[in-house]
């Protein structure tokens, strides 16, 4: 091999990548907030709703300080994959009932997918463990009724909002350690 010519910068530095990941997460958080407002406006919720198949919230923002970069990114990726699956399920199962939210739900799914790819690239650039994907989860059962589906939508968007809020805080904190 000959003398080493320098290469141009091929792609963003991981720290710049983290900045754009934070921006994307923030914009997804805002999308989710707006969608939640629309959902509550069209289908008012009677109290809080939960769904057993959703991931439990990673942790309180206060406990973030003790976290390490690998565990934050790995956990965040796993949780967001689960939410992506739930959003896809919601769109399939509730197509007609949630038609009024459809363009926004589609955008949410696309951006969620983009964020997941960004996180994976970041983990790859940093050479952090890319864990084997969880065994395929059993398919989500269709909602028992239209109202059951709407309750599920409230639970999915509410959980995703909390997860993204945690993600923004976590990623900003991690930026200081990179």
């Amino acid at each position: 091999p000959g003398p080493p010519p320098g290469s141009p910068r091929a792609s963003p530095d991981p720290r710049a990548e983290l900045d754009s990941t934070v921006l994307l997460t923030r914009s997804l958080l805002e999308d989710t907030r707006q969608l939640t407002i629309q959902l509550k406006d069209k289908f008012p919720a009677d109290g809080d709703h939960n769904l057993d198949s959703l991931p439990t919230l990673a942790m309180s923002a206060g406990a973030l300080g003790a976290l390490q970069l690998p565990s934050v990114l790995t956990r965040l990726r796993a949780d967001l994959l689960s939410y992506l699956r739930h959003v896809q399920w919601l769109r399939r199962a509730m197509g007609s009932s949630l038609k009024t939210l459809e363009p926004e739900l589609g955008t949410l799914q696309t951006r969620l997918d983009r964020l997941l790819r960004r996180l994976q690239l970041l983990m790859s650039r940093l050479a952090l463990p890319q864990l084997p994907p969880d065994p395929p989860a059993p398919p989500l059962a269709p909602p028992s009724s239209t109202w059951g589906g709407i309750r599920a939508a409230h639970a999915i968007l509410g959980g995703l909002h909390l997860t993204l809020d945690w993600a923004v805080r976590g990623l900003l904190l991690l930026k200081t350690r990179l």
């Epitope: 091929a10 792609s11 690998p70 994959l81 690239l121 650039r125 890319q130």
Partner: antibody, heavy 114, light 111 residues
């Protein structure tokens, strides 16, 4: 400009040792994982070892496990590969790379022969 | 024997479109992990051509494109030029081997 410059290659007898170094410049080396990838004469690329940006995670190909050790010194912007118990089949050009890998050095030739 | 399977050779005439495939399994490409493509010109080090399945690093012409579906990925080169004659490698993380893996490489000849 991004540059990765390998050194330390050469001729060594079977069972011998070598330490490869890779000096990085032109980018924030400490924010990237570091790889060693090799290419035997006339063959394809074979991943050898990988270390995370901060040195906390290390991964090795089965063919070198227990014989090679990857390490890094971020204060010196340098990646290392300590190669022990070398075999004839380790003969190859060894490339240092960073990131996905996004950036590659030009390689250093390691020849294991008696 | 490489974990990712590529055809050993491919060819095309200038201006043509050529596609190189990369076949994997459920522990690498099929597990949702990214595929990257590298170009190695004769006598030089590999260069990143496509990352994250379809993203092009700055400086890579848009004649090069990548895609992924299921357990396979492919690299397409349109408007083939003589300077594209090189070896092309796909790579992905393998979760069962716990490390990156490369395809065996495809030698592209421009006729």
């Amino acid at each position: 400009e991004v540059q990765l410059l390998e050194s330390g290659g050469g001729l060594v007898q079977p069972g011998g040792s070598l330490r490869l170094s890779c000096a990085a410049s032109g980018f924030t080396f400490s924010s990237y994982g570091g790889h060693w990838v090799r290419q035997a004469p006339g063959k394809g690329l074979e991943w050898v070892a990988l270390i995370s940006y901060d040195g906390s995670y290390k991964y090795y190909a089965d063919s070198v496990k227990g014989r090679f050790t990857i390490s890094r010194d971020n204060s010196k912007n340098t990646l290392y590969l300590q190669m022990n118990s070398l075999r004839a089949e380790d003969t190859a050009v060894y490339y240092c790379a960073a990131g996905v890998p996004d950036y590659w050095g030009q390689g250093t030739l390691v020849t294991v022969s008696s | 024997q490489s974990v990712l399977t590529q055809p050993p050779s491919a060819s095309g005439t200038p201006g043509q479109r050529v596609t190189i495939s990369c076949s994997g399994s459920s522990s690498n490409i099929g597990s949702g992990l990214d595929v990257h493509w590298y170009q190695q010109l004769p006598g030089t080090a590999p260069k990143l051509l496509i990352y994250s399945n379809e993203e092009r690093p700055s400086g890579v012409p848009d004649r090069f494109s990548g895609s992924k579906s299921g357990t396979s990925a492919s690299l397409a080169i349109s408007g083939l030029r003589s300077e594209d004659e090189a070896d092309y490698y796909c790579a992905a993380w393998d979760s069962s081997l716990y490390g990156p893996v490369f395809g065996g490489g495809t030698k592209l000849t421009v006729l």
